[in-house]
């Protein structure tokens, strides 16, 4: 660290005297000190020499000494104050720019301790602190005002009392700024945009800034808009806005628009693109299949997918039939937008009947024309089973009937006793039918099936049972046969709650 | 809340003095808190400031009127008097008395106005 | 002296419309602007002091802003009541001054 002679942390001398001060480090040294007239400066390797043989009270300050070369950065210092009783203050600065909240340091150095008893800060011509001004002295630095706000940029005088009478430093102009958080928020609106060649369109940019001092432009692929900008005050924020009107888009204007602005903060920006079409559109899409199959009872969402523009003049959801003249209640149908240009077309069928099974279609009309996106609807049917004892060309034989959707498969089981359905360990006999006979196979129905099973002599102790399942659930009859005629047993009754 | 009151004459011939008094009720005129103004409005235009005075008698006067300017301060009374010399019809106006905030540098609280006019 | 330039001059206005007002001073006179408003035979009024602070019983529709030289009065929803003549007036250096004035009449 280096040493400073004379070796004491003040010192007070008159107008017109000789200062020398002197430091010494192991190293080359430096002095640094407030910025006065008169002083010379003698530097001898490890050691410099700063003296004046005329001090004023401008040479009032605080004189540091540093060693460049010390790793450690070690500096030593010494204030100097020149009493002059003419001139109890040395301003550094007449100018001090800070932040809000930020201390500002309104630099007179008093030049004579003797006086820090009566010093005083006060505003020009005398007038008192604004109210709320939280401050503190130094007489090495000076006059500190704690956590600055805006109305308090003003021009202040540091005072103190000389012989009963108060003598004003020069003034000094603090200029406190608002804090800019970062660069100014931004919209562009809309976020996208379709026109039609020919029609009028506007792009609105806009950015704020709790400070005035931020710039905003428009870019379209790249190329800066000259527009006229308005601005505003609003919510304690300055806006900046630009608006881009245009009578009668072209292919031309198509493309990328780029709200940017910037402040010292650095720079924010937004895009949209702008689509510009030859005439009207209008499109129909689903990410589900057309086709589509649920089980009776469950619930189903019909989603439909519209890009268009202009606008929909009109839209509904209507059923096609086969069952009924039944049209989805409104309630059911939902539509939700997307963006400006997509929507989405919900109708929902809850616990779905029989009679609802067939063909939905969704219309949509602009000034492109009418769309419509329709879905098959089939419902999925567990089998229902019916045995009955027939002859067929003199043959003793019993007919199955099976229905359901999809197409039920059918089994045939003998088993011993008799019970309203076989068990494994009671089954005798099993034949699988790979292909019964379709009865009926008509779009959004049921599928009827037959299957016969030839049987010379009915075992009296027995019982034949028909099985029919799919991926839906399965059913079931037993045929137990009694020595007046034929006994059947059809399966506990399938319940069905739409 | 400070409120004041202006009297004087409405008339006043030319080369005479103008001589107005504003009367304060509601505060103190010797609070440190305020300056005791005084302002001018010219038919139909803006306003103009004249000068204003301390509680103790320090005083700030615009420099066009300076020459012929004296405001005064009786704090017994509760007044402060504005004197304008060797006026004429440019000095015809609406004069105001206004309480400066000090703290503030602002005009808060102002008298009703009276017109004075120059005229033979 | 300092001197305040205000613009317009003159504003017509519909009720509920926003009315923008600018001052400039001549010189840096930081945040010791102040507004005032004088509706028609009646002394002013103070609104706005060092630039955006409400005086007491001021309504929130009106605000100010600005800083350094270039400061804005803004009226939010203009009312009936409003309509009056509207002055900024700098305190930084005697002597003091006020602008030319801004009068707000309503269509």
């Known amino acids: 660290i280096p040493v400073i002679e004379p070796s004491v942390p003040e010192l007070v001398v008159k107008p017109g005297a000789t200062v020398t001060l002197r430091c010494v480090g192991n190293g080359s040294v430096e002095w640094d000190g407030p910025p006065s007239p008169h002083w010379t400066l003698y530097s001898d390797g490890s050691s410099s020499i700063l003296s004046t043989n005329n001090a004023t009270f401008q040479n009032t300050g605080t004189y540091r000494c540093t060693e460049p070369g010390d790793p450690l950065g070690g500096s030593a210092a010494i204030h100097l104050y020149v009493k002059d009783p003419a001139r109890p203050w040395n301003v550094l600065a007449q100018e001090v720019v800070v932040f809000e909240d930020q201390d500002a340091l309104l630099p007179c150095l008093l030049t004579d301790p003797v006086l820090e008893a009566g010093v005083s800060l006060v505003r020009v011509r005398g007038r008192p602190l604004m109210r709320h001004t939280n401050y503190s002295f130094s007489p090495w630095h000076g006059f500190t005002i704690h956590r600055a706000k805006f109305i308090q940029s003003q021009d202040y005088q540091c005072s103190a009392l000389m012989g009963g009478r108060k003598v004003m430093s020069i003034s000094i102009r603090l200029k406190v700024q608002k804090v800019i958080p970062g660069p100014p928020a931004l919209t562009l609106v809309p976020a996208e945009l379709v026109r039609i060649r020919g029609e009028a369109a506007q792009i609105v940019c806009s950015a704020s800034s709790v400070d005035v001092n931020f710039d905003v432009f428009l870019q379209h692929n790249n190329t800066k808009l000259a527009i006229p900008q308005q601005s505003d005050f609003h919510n304690n924020r300055y806006q900046k806005v630009l608006t881009l009107n245009l009578d009668q888009v072209d292919f031309q204007h198509a493309g990328n628009y780029s709200c940017v602005a910037s402040n010292v903060q650095g720079k924010h920006s937004t895009s949209m693109f702008f689509r510009v079409v030859e005439s009207a559109y209008l499109n129909l899409s689903s990410e589900q299949n057309l086709i589509q199959e649920v089980t009776v009872g469950e619930g189903l969402n019909l989603k439909v997918m519209v890009e268009a523009y202009p606008g929909l003049q009109g839209f509904n959801w209507t059923y096609l039939g086969p069952f009924s003249d039944h049209q989805p209640e409104p309630k059911l149908a939902n539509a939700t937008t997307k963006d400006t240009y997509r929507h989405t077309f919900t109708l929902s069928l809850p616990r779905l009947k029989p009679s609802e099974a067939g063909r939905y279609s969704f219309l949509a009309r602009n000034p492109g024309g009418w769309r419509a996106l329709t879905f098959e609807l089939t419902l999925r049917y567990p089998p229902e089973v019916s045995v009955i004892w027939t002859f067929i060309n003199g043959s003793g034989t019993l007919l199955c009937a099976a229905s359901g959707y999809p197409q039920p498969n059918v089994t045939w089981l003998q088993c011993s006793g008799h019970t309203d359905r076989c068990d494994e360990a009671q089954v005798l006999q099993v034949w699988d039918d790979p292909y019964p006979e379709v009865l009926s196979q008509e779009p959004f129905h049921k599928v009827t099936v037959q299957s016969l099973l030839t049987v010379e002599t009915l075992e009296h102790n027995q019982t034949y049972e028909c099985r029919a399942h799919n991926s839906v659930g399965s059913g079931s009859w037993a045929f137990i046969p009694i020595s007046a005629g034929a006994h059947t047993h059809p399966p506990d009754e399938f319940l069905f709650t739409p | 809340q400070v409120q004041l009151q202006e009297s004087g004459p409405g008339l006043v011939k030319p080369s005479q003095t103008l001589s107005l008094t504003c009367t304060v009720s509601g505060g103190s005129i010797s609070s440190g808190g305020y300056y005791w103004s005084w302002i001018r409005q010219h038919p139909g235009k803006g306003l103009e400031w004249i000068g204003y005075?301390?509680?103790?008698?320090?005083?700030y006067y615009n420099p066009s009127l300076k020459s012929r300017l004296t405001i005064s301060v009786d704090t017994s009374k509760h007044q402060f008097s504005l004197r304008l010399s060797s006026v004429t019809s440019a000095d015809t106006a609406v004069y105001y008395c206004a309480s400066l905030d000090l703290y503030g540098d602002y005009f808060d609280y102002w008298g009703q106005g009276t017109l004075v006019t120059v005229s033979s | 002296e300092i001197v305040l330039t205000q613009s317009p001059d003159f504003q017509s206005v519909t009720p509920k419309e926003k009315v923008t007002i600018t001052c400039r001073a001549s010189q840096y006179i930081g945040s010791s602007l102040h507004w005032y408003q004088q509706t028609p035979d009646q002394s002013p009024k103070l609104l706005i002091n060092y630039v955006s602070q409400s005086f007491s019983g001021v309504p929130s529709r009106f605000s100010g802003s600005g800083s350094g030289t270039d400061f804005t009065l803004t009226i939010n929803s203009l009312e009936a009541e409003d309509a009056a003549t509207y002055y900024c007036h700098q305190s930084s250096s005697l002597p003091f001054t006020f602008g030319p004035g801004t009068k707000v009449d309503i269509k």
């Open positions: 005075i301390s509680y103790s008698g320090d005083t």
